[in-house]
């Protein structure tokens, strides 16, 4: 029994941190192998992950971790049985990977904006929440080559867009990633995506159509 | 206190099969790993495999797979092993002896507790 | 699998000297995590063999402090200040690094 790709881990910085590798050989996660975690501190606990499979060979193993400070190293050590196939130490705040911005939602906005609005996934007390910049993907479902990357790099968790840069009767899906820059983290999952049809209409068809008279 | 108390000695045909008992106490059974481990007269030690009691997993040595099966009753804070096909080979005496803990650290030791033996001879 | 060899089958010892006990292996024990997983083991005259030292030079609960481990990835010494009658016994290496776990063929400390 061999380790491939040693753990790669990385975590929320609030509650969970995510480790993931691979062995030479397609691998029962649960049944072979486990994850031993203790914070590197004189009389912290030992604990167990047992992880789940990824893929064939791929294991991931989800750990509940203390609200994190960023001084703390975890110690891991992976086992076969009483084997110790690896062992490890991971930094939780140096290997951020931000939660998932949640319920992203479309309205129509006055002067034919949409207006694009998510929640941001940290609760206000927690570091990360003032540190959040995100990423929105909006892309034509029909059309993979008409799409739009958006980065916001202001506070709230919105976007307006306007109705105009998107091209008229067609079904659109924007999704949402975020990151730390401040803790260089990795981007965070995309959101699901939300769908709406864009139906703005050129501002040229929007002009009253008046017969126009000539006053001499 | 920790203690491993081992069945008493058998003395058994050429082709029958044998099961030999470890009992704990003094410890959370469920906790460590069980080795056993043969030692042939006058010889050295030889790793049979290992059990992790609170789901059965087991490891062998590739040279006893087949000849030896390894099982707990949780109940009884018990572990078995069971020797089949038996020869002249298989007379030696088999020890139990606790392993690490499931909960360890890379800190470990092991084989910190040994149960007193169990002496099988094979003999028509 | 990884071959423990202990070249010495007995070493001869006076009581109150100190003996030194060779062990080798096929692959190097020192584990990325700079722990060797070496022990030694006692079995004494008529009984279950005893750990002595884990960890190559982790001295076991209970075991007197005149018993010592050193050595590096491959070659290890199990050393005995002021030997006792009641050391008497076969020594025995063992590697923790990889299944099967394997012992040396052990050494008997004999009283001169």
């Known amino acids: 029994v061999k380790v491939l790709h040693e753990p790669s881990c990385f975590s929320d910085y609030i509650s969970t941190s995510v480790c993931q590798w691979k062995m030479d050989h397609p691998t029962n996660c649960s049944a072979e192998l486990r994850l031993s975690y203790q914070l590197d501190f004189m009389g912290s606990e030992n604990h167990t992950c047992v992880p789940e499979n990824r893929e064939d060979s791929v294991c991931v193993c989800s750990m509940p971790i203390d609200d994190a400070v960023e001084a703390d190293v975890y110690q891991l050590d992976l086992w076969a049985g009483q084997q110790l196939l690896w062992s490890g130490s991971f930094q939780p705040s140096k290997h951020v990977k931000p939660r998932t911005p949640g319920n992203l939602t479309v309205h129509p906005n006055i002067s034919h904006t949409w207006l694009l609005m998510w929640t941001n996934p940290y609760p206000t007390e927690n570091h990360l929440h003032s540190e959040l910049t995100y990423m929105v993907n909006v892309s034509n479902d029909n059309d993979p080559e008409d799409f739009k990357v958006y980065n916001v790099t202001y506070m709230g968790p919105t976007l307006r867009l306007a109705a105009s840069t998107l091209k008229s009767g067609a079904s659109y899906s924007a999704r949402v990633r975020a990151w730390a820059q401040t803790y260089n983290s990795t981007w965070s999952d995309w959101s699901p995506s939300t769908t709406w049809l864009n139906y703005y209409e050129p501002w040229e068809q929007h002009l009253p159509h008046h017969h126009h008279h000539h006053h001499h | 206190e920790v203690q491993l108390q081992q069945s008493g000695p058998e003395l058994v045909k050429p082709g029958a099969s044998v099961k030999i008992s470890c009992k704990a106490s003094g410890y959370t059974f469920t906790d460590y790993y069980m080795n056993w481990v043969k030692q042939s007269h006058g010889k050295s030690l030889e790793w049979i495999g290992d059990?992790?009691?609170?789901?059965?997993?087991?490891s062998y040595n590739q040279k006893f797979k087949g000849k030896a099966t390894l099982t707990v009753d949780k109940s009884s804070s018990a572990a078995y092993m069971e020797l089949r096909s038996l020869t002249s080979e298989d007379s030696a005496v088999y020890y139990c002896?606790?392993?690490?803990?499931?909960?360890?650290?890379?800190?470990?030791?092991?084989?910190?507790?040994w149960g007193q033996g169990t002496s099988v001879t094979v003999s028509s | 699998d990884i071959v423990m060899t202990q070249a010495a089958p007995s070493v001869p010892v006076t009581p109150g000297e100190s003996v030194s006990i060779s062990c080798r292996s096929s692959?190097?024990?020192?584990?990325?995590?700079?722990?060797?997983?070496l022990f030694w083991f006692v079995q004494r005259p008529g009984q279950s063999p005893q750990l002595l030292i884990y960890r190559m030079s982790n001295l076991a609960s209970g075991v007197p402090d005149r018993f010592s481990g050193s050595g590096s990835g491959t070659a290890f010494t199990l050393r005995i200040s002021r030997v006792e009658a009641e050391d008497v016994g076969v020594y025995y290496c063992?590697?923790?690094?990889?299944?099967?776990?394997?012992f040396g063929s052990g050494t008997k400390l004999d009283i001169k």
């Open positions: 059990i992790i009691p609170s789901n059965g997993g087991t």
């Open positions: 692959k190097s024990l020192l584990h990325s995590n700079g722990n060797t997983y």
């Open positions: 002896a606790r392993g690490i803990s499931y909960y360890g650290n890379r800190y470990y030791f092991t084989m910190d507790y």
């Open positions: 063992m590697q923790h690094l990889e299944y099967p776990f394997t």
